[in-house]
Structures are given as structure tokens and as C-alpha cells.
């Protein structure tokens, strides 16, 4: 299981305000069992963007269907991007734990920059 890698192929993505941003992430293995979460920023103050395990995130949709049992594509689409969404986004794999899941491995991050809406 130590061989699992979280791959974020894009170092940076640039999106016009009002458009959608696709942030790519794949895992190289189904093991260990546990959810993927997306965060903006790193460290204790990071902002949760999407949690595969819990909740509904209205601006975020997954590119693939995560209910399919062998899915390893955890890319997300964030709608209606604004300048406030700029930052570095991390795709993070968690290992199932009790009582709480444990952070296992993070992708290298994708920097999202927001261009002014074309006039």
C-alpha cells in the first residue's frame, strides 16, 4: 500500500472568472481503502473543498462517478469561478481509520489562477 501515489498532473490551471475549473487527480491504487478529499491550501488552516465521504458541495462535481467501485479518478469541476477561488488545491488520500480516517498521501498541488472575465 505504500506504493499508492496521488497524481495531480497539472502544476497550474488558469480559468476565466465565471467559468468552470477542472482540477485533475488520479490515484494509482485502490489500496488502502479510504476517501479522497480536496483542500485549498496546506497546513492546519486549509479549506475543505470536497469530501468524498461526507456532505454535498454545490459548486463541486466529480468528473467521474465515484460510486463506481473501481474508480481511481478523483478529478473535480468547480463551477462559477471567482477571483476568491485562486490558490493551490491539493488532492489528499485518506486511509480508513477508527474512529477517524488518517491522512495518507497528498498530491503535489495544482495552482488555480483566475483571469478577468473577457469583456
Amino acid at each position: 500500500e505504500e506504493g499508492l501515489q496521488v497524481i495531480q498532473p497539472d502544476k497550474s490551471v488558469s480559468v476565466a472568472a465565471g467559468e468552470s475549473a477542472i482540477l485533475h487527480c488520479t490515484a494509482t491504487s485502490l489500496i488502502p481503502v479510504g476517501p479522497i478529499q480536496w483542500f485549498r491550501g496546506a497546513g492546519p488552516g486549509r479549506e475543505l473543498i470536497y469530501n468524498q465521504k461526507e456532505g454535498h458541495f454545490p459548486r463541486v462535481t466529480t468528473v467521474s462517478d465515484l460510486t463506481k467501485r473501481n474508480n481511481m479518478d478523483f478529478s473535480i469541476r468547480i463551477g462559477n469561478i471567482t477571483p476568491a477561488d485562486a490558490g493551490t488545491y491539493y488532492c489528499v488520500k485518506f486511509r480508513k481509520g477508527s474512529p477517524d480516517d488518517v491522512e495518507f498521501k497528498s498530491g503535489a498541488g495544482t495552482e488555480l489562477s483566475v483571469r478577468a472575465k473577457p469583456s
Epitope: 476517501p35 469530501n51 468524498q52 465521504k53 461526507e54 456532505g55 454535498h56 454545490p58 462535481t61 466529480t62 462517478d65 465515484l66 460510486t67 463506481k68 480508513k96 477508527s98 474512529p99 477517524d100
Partner: antibody, heavy 120, light 107 residues
């Protein structure tokens, strides 16, 4: 094997309260989101409320918002539905069901249901 | 809210024949449509998840298709034990909603 057993149903007068319970066994309860769904006599299924695995995310149907409260105790493997200010239209069989992981997942196991009758 | 409309409301099919149930959504639910079977006096049972995936233990005569707003549940060769009410349900966004149900009987 997976088991969900509801209890706490019965006959209650309008305006009164009732607390339903769902005892879970045969799986790791704390891994699953849980749902209450109801079915009025001779009618279809209506989602009532859902709660995520750690209780961080809770949603209610508009028809019960402000009157019903869903909760869970992962240490006891139990799901609850506190029903206040009951109305005649709340009369139904109440089912608990489990949902693996996040919001988009289906309800893969259901209990047998408990009947709630609201009548004066 | 996403309204789900099933058609027909009831369906009588001869044993061994194909039964088809449709579910239309008032807006796209992507592939997050699930199908349940409810036999008289029993709790619902998951048959198909995410439009086309057969739940473990469900006979292969059941299949699902569709995406977006139009979905279909097909029973390729109806058996006596398939007499039930079938419901579609979306999990694309809250609130979760169900179709009104389709009653399948033997002709």
C-alpha cells in the same frame, strides 16, 4: 450479515412527540451515512432526513424541517429520529437505511420499518 | 427540487417477456440515479446503482441505462418473483427524491 432494526413507532396524538431508533449491526456503522425514509399507507417513498458518518452534514426534507431531528451515536451503533409536533400527514412506515460514503451513493440496505400513526 | 416521473404507473407483462420502466428527471442528475424493488409488505431493495451498475446478488435479468434526465430499468425476462413496485431515486443533489413508483404485475 448487515442488519438494521427500527423501533419506537406507535400511535400518538397530533402535536405530540416520538423518538425512533435504528439499531445497526454486521458492518462498521461509523463508515456509513444514514437515512430515514418514510412511506405513507398505500403511497410511495419519501426521503425524510440524512446524516453523514461523523454527523458533520445533516439534511432534512422541507416537510419535516424544524420538527424532526436526526442524530446518531457511533459508539452504540444507533441512529435516531426525534419527531416533534407530529401531524396526521406524518403517519407512515419509517425505514432507516445506510449509504456508503458521500452524498451521491445509493441506499444499499434498509430496515424492515416501524409504523408511526398520528391520530386523535 | 429534482422531480422524478416514472412511466408507466403500472405494467402487466407475461412471464418470460421484457418489462421496461422509464424515469424522467426535471433536470440533469448526471448518472446518480438508482433503482429499488419493493415487494408487498417488505422494505425496498437496491437493484441498480448509478444508472447502470448491478448491485451484488441481483439477477442479471435486471439492467439499467441512461444519463442526464432519461433513465430506464429493464427486466429482460419477467419472473413471478419480480412482481413488485419499482422506484427510481436521484442522489445528485439534496433533497433526495424518488419517483412515484411503477407496479409490475403478471399478465
Amino acid at each position: 450479515q448487515v442488519q438494521l432494526v427500527e423501533s419506537g413507532g406507535g400511535v400518538v396524538q397530533p402535536g405530540r412527540s416520538l423518538r425512533l431508533s435504528c439499531a445497526a449491526s454486521g458492518f462498521t456503522f461509523s463508515d456509513y451515512g444514514m437515512i430515514w425514509v418514510r412511506q405513507a399507507p398505500g403511497k410511495g417513498l419519501e426521503w425524510v432526513a440524512s446524516i453523514s458518518s461523523s454527523s458533520s452534514y445533516i439534511y432534512y426534507a422541507d416537510s419535516v424541517k424544524g420538527r424532526f431531528t436526526i442524530s446518531r451515536d457511533n459508539s452504540k451503533n444507533r441512529l435516531y429520529l426525534q419527531m416533534n409536533s407530529l401531524r396526521a400527514e406524518d403517519t407512515a412506515v419509517y425505514y432507516c437505511a445506510r449509504r456508503y460514503y458521500g452524498f451521491n451513493y445509493p441506499f444499499d440496505y434498509w430496515g424492515q420499518g416501524t409504523m408511526v400513526t398520528v391520530s386523535s | 427540487d429534482t422531480v422524478l416521473t416514472q412511466s408507466p404507473d403500472s405494467l402487466a407483462v407475461s412471464l418470460g417477456q421484457r418489462a421496461t420502466i422509464n424515469c424522467g428527471a426535471s433536470k440533469s442528475v448526471r448518472t446518480y440515479m438508482h433503482w429499488y424493488q419493493q415487494k408487498p409488505g417488505q422494505q425496498p431493495k437496491l437493484l441498480i446503482y448509478s444508472a447502470s451498475n448491478l448491485e451484488a446478488g441481483v439477477p442479471s435479468r435486471f439492467s439499467g441505462s441512461g444519463s442526464g434526465t432519461d433513465f430506464t430499468l429493464t427486466i429482460s425476462s419477467l419472473q413471478a418473483e419480480d412482481v413488485a413496485v419499482y422506484y427510481c431515486q436521484q442522489s445528485n443533489e439534496p433533497p433526495y427524491t424518488f419517483g412515484q413508483g411503477t407496479k409490475v404485475e403478471i399478465k
